[in-house]
């Protein structure tokens, strides 16, 4: 273990007005999963709905790059490669945990938060509004 | 802010042996997400590889729930209806961290892991293997 | 097992392009999981990373500040190798360059696997 | 650009005895981005930790990592006649941010 050196200004443990804070020890277990995960194999490649992933970076948050998926077409891929428009190609989206530094610059003061990703891309049917 | 309860044997912030350990705040903010998302609306319906949600609940876990997609089919719905199984319905996986409890029961005292969810399905052209 | 097996020369004349080869075996240049770089090492600079490359349904292109203006990395997909071009050369660019897998699993960043290493010197 | 400085240059021990190997950064930098190699005369480096504490794999249990924000320590808890080499941390900030230390020689006393 290490002693944690206390930086001016960061807040410490024992401040009973410290909001909602816990102790969190940063050595991540893998659970269900390799060290080195084939993310998704290559189906934005094979999908009926591809996409595109594009890096998301930002050195203050972990995890720093994550990789978002944008869909390539508005409609969906047929079987002879051209795009079918009477279907719909939608991202697949999903909130994850990141942390970020707060106060930023505190080595050992974090701050959890919630965002909203695109995993990949989806075919569905659309949704047709009848006006009467 | 609230005073944080002592469980004996939970570790507590001034332990110097408590390994990596650093200060969380769970007020968490919610970036470009609202805090109940309509989980990617009901694509698991209307996708030509629809799948199903299974609620994964671990009371030692934050978050306590999390839906797993489990694909509905092998193969992908074709407009009428009826299964193709020359094309295959496949999860698409994305590596997530969330908060356990450690020790267990511990009401303010967290590991990180990392966890494989699917978070929803999408329709792929199968890569076949030919045989010499 | 992966491995990494580096060629080219060993002597490039100043103001000329520096040349070397990265084949990958056990392991696809394309991996969505990984990313392919070089790193050299001098007495004088110690280790210095170069660049990457990396495959997220495009190439990515990733070169360090110092050497941004002279550097290339390219995949060859057919042979499942990537190459380094150092553009310009000086005498301060001899070193022994290493090319290496970097695990790029969104959560970690590290260099798991290295090439032998070859040492490039940079005279007339 | 995060400068790491490691400390000592040089550690002169006894086979036995413990190495305590310290690597400090300019400014914080994510432990989960930051690894430890091994690197001994003619030969390139060795991964030994990755994310400041976790060992690579075949890394034997005498090898441990620990530190978070700017200051991250390597420790040999009992040193074996082939751990003698140069030791170096390196960081990852950003996709154009990544350096490495000048290193740590570990040699025999």
């Known amino acids: 273990g290490i002693a944690i050196p206390r930086n001016s200004g960061c807040p410490n443990s024992e401040d009973k007005n410290f909001p909602r804070t816990v102790m969190v020890n940063l050595n991540i277990h893998n659970r269900n999963t390799s060290t080195n995960p084939k993310r998704s194999s290559d189906y934005y490649n094979r999908s009926t709905s591809p996409w595109n992933l594009h890096r998301n970076e930002d050195p203050e948050r972990y995890p720093s790059v994550i990789w978002e998926a944008k869909c390539r077409h508005l409609g969906c891929v047929k079987a002879d490669g051209n795009v079918d428009y009477h279907m719909n190609s939608v991202p697949i989206q999903q909130e994850i945990l990141v942390l970020r530094r707060e106060p930023r610059h505190c080595p050992n003061s974090f701050r959890l938060e919630k965002i909203l990703v695109s995993v990949g891309c989806t075919c569905v049917t659309p949704i047709v509004h009848h006006v009467a | 802010g609230i005073a944080i309860p002592r469980n004996s044997g939970c570790p507590n912030s001034e332990d110097k042996n408590f390994p990596r350990t650093v200060m969380v705040n769970l007020n968490i903010h919610n970036r470009n997400t609202s805090t109940n998302p309509k989980r990617s609306s009901d694509y698991y319906n209307r996708s030509t590889s629809p799948w199903n949600l299974h609620r994964n609940e671990d009371p030692e876990r934050y978050p306590s729930v999390i839906w797993e997609a489990k694909c509905r089919h092998l193969g992908c719905v074709k407009a009428d209806g009826n299964v193709d199984y020359h094309m295959n319905s496949v999860p698409i996986q994305q590596e997530i961290l969330v908060l356990r409890r450690e020790p267990r029961h511990c009401p303010n005292s967290f590991r990180l892991e990392k966890i494989l969810v699917s978070v929803g399905c999408t329709c792929v052209t199968p890569i076949v293997h030919h045989v010499a | 097992q992966v491995q990494l097996q580096q060629s080219g020369p060993g002597l490039v004349k100043p103001s000329q392009t520096l040349s070397l080869t990265c084949a990958i075996s056990?392991?696809?240049?394309?991996?969505?999981?990984?990313?392919w770089g070089w790193i050299r090492q001098s007495p004088s600079r110690g280790l210095e990373w170069l660049g990457r490359?990396?495959?997220?349904?495009?190439?990515?292109?990733d070169y360090a500040v110092s050497v941004k203006s002279r550097i290339t990395i390219n995949p060859d997909t057919s042979k499942n190798q990537f190459s380094l071009q150092l553009n310009s050369v000086t005498p301060e660019d001899t070193a022994v360059y290493y090319c290496?897998?970097?695990?790029?699993?969104?959560?970690?960043?590290?260099?798991?696997?290295w090439g032998q290493g070859t040492l490039v010197t940079v005279s007339s | 650009e995060i400068v790491l400085t490691q400390s000592p240059a040089t550690l002169s021990l006894s086979p036995g005895e413990r190495a305590t190997l310290s690597c400090r950064a300019s400014?914080?930098?994510?432990?989960?981005?930051l690894a430890w190699y091994q690197q001994k005369p003619g030969q390139a480096p060795r991964l030994l930790i990755y994310?400041?504490?976790n060992r690579a794999t075949g890394i034997p249990a005498r090898f441990s990592g620990s530190g978070s924000g700017t200051d991250f320590t390597l420790t040999i808890s009992s040193l074996e006649p082939e751990d003698f080499a140069v030791y170096y941390c390196?960081?990852?900030?950003?996709?154009?941010?990544?350096?490495f230390g000048q290193g740590t020689k570990v040699e025999i006393k």
């Open positions: 290496a897998r970097e695990v790029d699993s969104m959560y970690y960043s590290y260099f798991d696997i």
């Open positions: 056990g392991d696809s240049v394309s991996s969505s999981s990984a990313a």
């Open positions: 490359i990396s495959y997220r349904s495009k190439w990515y292109n």
């Open positions: 400014q914080n930098v994510w432990a989960f981005y």
């Open positions: 994310g400041a504490s």
């Open positions: 390196q960081q990852y900030r950003s996709t154009l941010s990544l350096t």
